[in-house]
């Protein structure tokens, strides 16, 4: 199909060598009541139809996506050829930085319904570069984290370093859609929750003498919750005596949650006493049985093959720990009468 | 910091057999839930089969019959068998942990099906 009736845009992603980082591309076709542009080589912008033919923004999972060639090739199906490039319904999602991602895309509906629509399309002309300034030290990340429960900000890694008296009008989207009321290079969230989270894109528009480009970057909000300030507590066993029957086989289970933390290195072990000496157990590994945002329940099983008269005398001490602490939780076995 | 080093994947023809494997390492414990995702060109990534402790399978409606997940709780791997496979398969495939409810990943071995 002819792109020269394409409405234009230039971006610009500038990445940082230093972290791992994803690009979009959002098929702007216009919304319906502004649609005359898509057919505007017909219309004046006064023009408008009585019905306007372009099926608008609310079926944009139905574009199809092309690069054109530097060479003049034909225009490539962007599914067939670029393994890294994702298409998620009118979004295009660059997984991995590069220069070889620099070109021209273009993306139009899929379904033509009218004679207009053949020139509804926008092409978008991506230059990428890698950072080269190293001026800005401490940009801000192209994966922030936000806590639950406290103030928090998202910061736009592009104008990170700039004050925000002189920083340009900035256009943010979360997950694709347009957040209208944030102009600023830093969206400011009074009270963070989980639905914070997200991809989001900043925008702002870079001019020249020659042409103005829009810079963009994209930054993954994850929302956590703070490091706990607890150490672990054992959930089981509760009891610090068992009733058992001796030359019988036994499993004593040890169950321990542990606060979120992000570096999270759990300690969970089963040891024995028996008067004076202590030794630790080789039990199986622990493994979790629970995980959510907030904690992590681990169990360790300590198996005895058949009970002792022996193993009455002995404490089995269940031990605990993360960076904040310790606990512990002995049990003391005792012979099942009648 | 948590580690998964992917394994197995290469060339095969439709009909023919695969075998992947996982190890995590850097963590003192089982994690929650082990699998396997895939990622075809152009498209999102997808569930295969994952396997939580203490033993419970979750599979792709697509593998169901041909794929099988095993876990070795002691060596923290998981394997994930493919039988029968078919061109439609041909992805990059994703190991997958879960820690404190989130995900964390391999780098992936590319899995070819040709026909």
């Known amino acids: 199909f002819n792109i020269s009736g394409c409405s234009t845009k230039k971006l610009l992603w500038t990445y940082s060598t230093r972290s791992e980082e994803e690009f979009v591309l959002f098929c702007d076709l216009p919304e319906p009541q502004k649609s005359h542009f898509c057919h505007r080589n017909r219309l004046s912008p006064k023009q408008v139809p009585e019905h306007l033919p372009f099926m608008g923004s609310n079926d944009l999972s139905d574009v199809q996506w092309y690069q054109q060639p530097s060479n003049g090739d034909p225009l490539e199906d962007i599914r067939k050829s670029y393994p890294h490039i994702i298409q998620d319904k009118c979004t295009l999602h660059f997984l991995t930085p590069g220069v070889n991602n620099s070109g021209s895309y273009i993306c139009r509906p899929k379904m033509i319904k009218s004679p207009y629509d053949v020139a509804c399309c926008v092409k978008m002309i991506l230059e990428v570069k890698p950072q080269t300034n190293a001026s800005c030290e401490y940009s801000a990340s192209h994966k922030q984290d936000l806590l639950l429960g406290s103030t928090g900000s998202i910061s736009c890694p592009s104008l990170s370093c700039q004050s925000d008296a002189q920083s340009p009008a900035v256009t943010w989207y979360k997950n694709g859609k347009l957040l209208s009321v944030e102009r600023s290079n830093r969206i400011v969230v009074d009270e963070v929750y989980d639905y914070h989270q997200g991809t989001y894109v900043c925008d702002y528009t870079q001019s020249d003498t020659v042409s103005s480009w829009t810079v963009r970057a994209v930054v993954q909000v994850r929302t956590i919750v703070g490091d706990t300030k607890l150490k672990p507590d054992i959930l089981d066993p509760v009891e610090d005596t068992l009733e058992v029957e001796l030359g019988k086989p036994l499993t004593i289970s040890c169950k321990a949650r542990f606060g979120f933390e992000r570096v999270f290195n759990p300690v969970i072990k089963w040891y024995i006493k028996d008067s004076d000496l202590e030794w630790e157990v080789s039990v199986p590994e622990a493994k979790s049985i629970k995980s959510t945002l907030k904690d992590e329940i681990i169990e360790r099983n300590i198996i005895l093959e058949k009970v002792t008269q022996r193993d009455l005398r002995r404490k089995f001490v269940c031990f605990v720990q993360n960076s904040i602490g310790n606990t512990t939780q002995s049990v003391q076995l005792k012979e099942k009468r009648g | 910091d948590v580690q998964l080093q992917e394994s197995g994947g290469g060339l095969v023809q439709a009909g023919g057999s695969l075998r992947l494997s996982c190890a995590a390492s850097?963590?003192?414990?089982?994690?929650?839930?082990m699998g396997w995702y895939r990622q075809a060109p152009g498209k999102q990534r997808e569930l295969v089969a994952d396997m939580v402790n203490g033993g419970s399978t979750n599979y792709a409606d697509s593998v169901k019959g041909r794929f099988t997940i095993f876990r070795d709780t002691a060596a923290n791997t998981v394997t994930l068998q493919m039988n029968n496979l078919k061109p439609d398969d041909t992805a990059v495939y994703y190991c997958?942990?879960?820690?404190?409810?989130?995900?964390?990943w391999g780098q992936g071995t590319q899995v070819t099906v040709s026909s």
């Open positions: 997958h942990i879960m820690i404190f409810g989130r995900a964390s």
């Open positions: 850097g963590i003192t414990f089982s994690p929650y839930v």
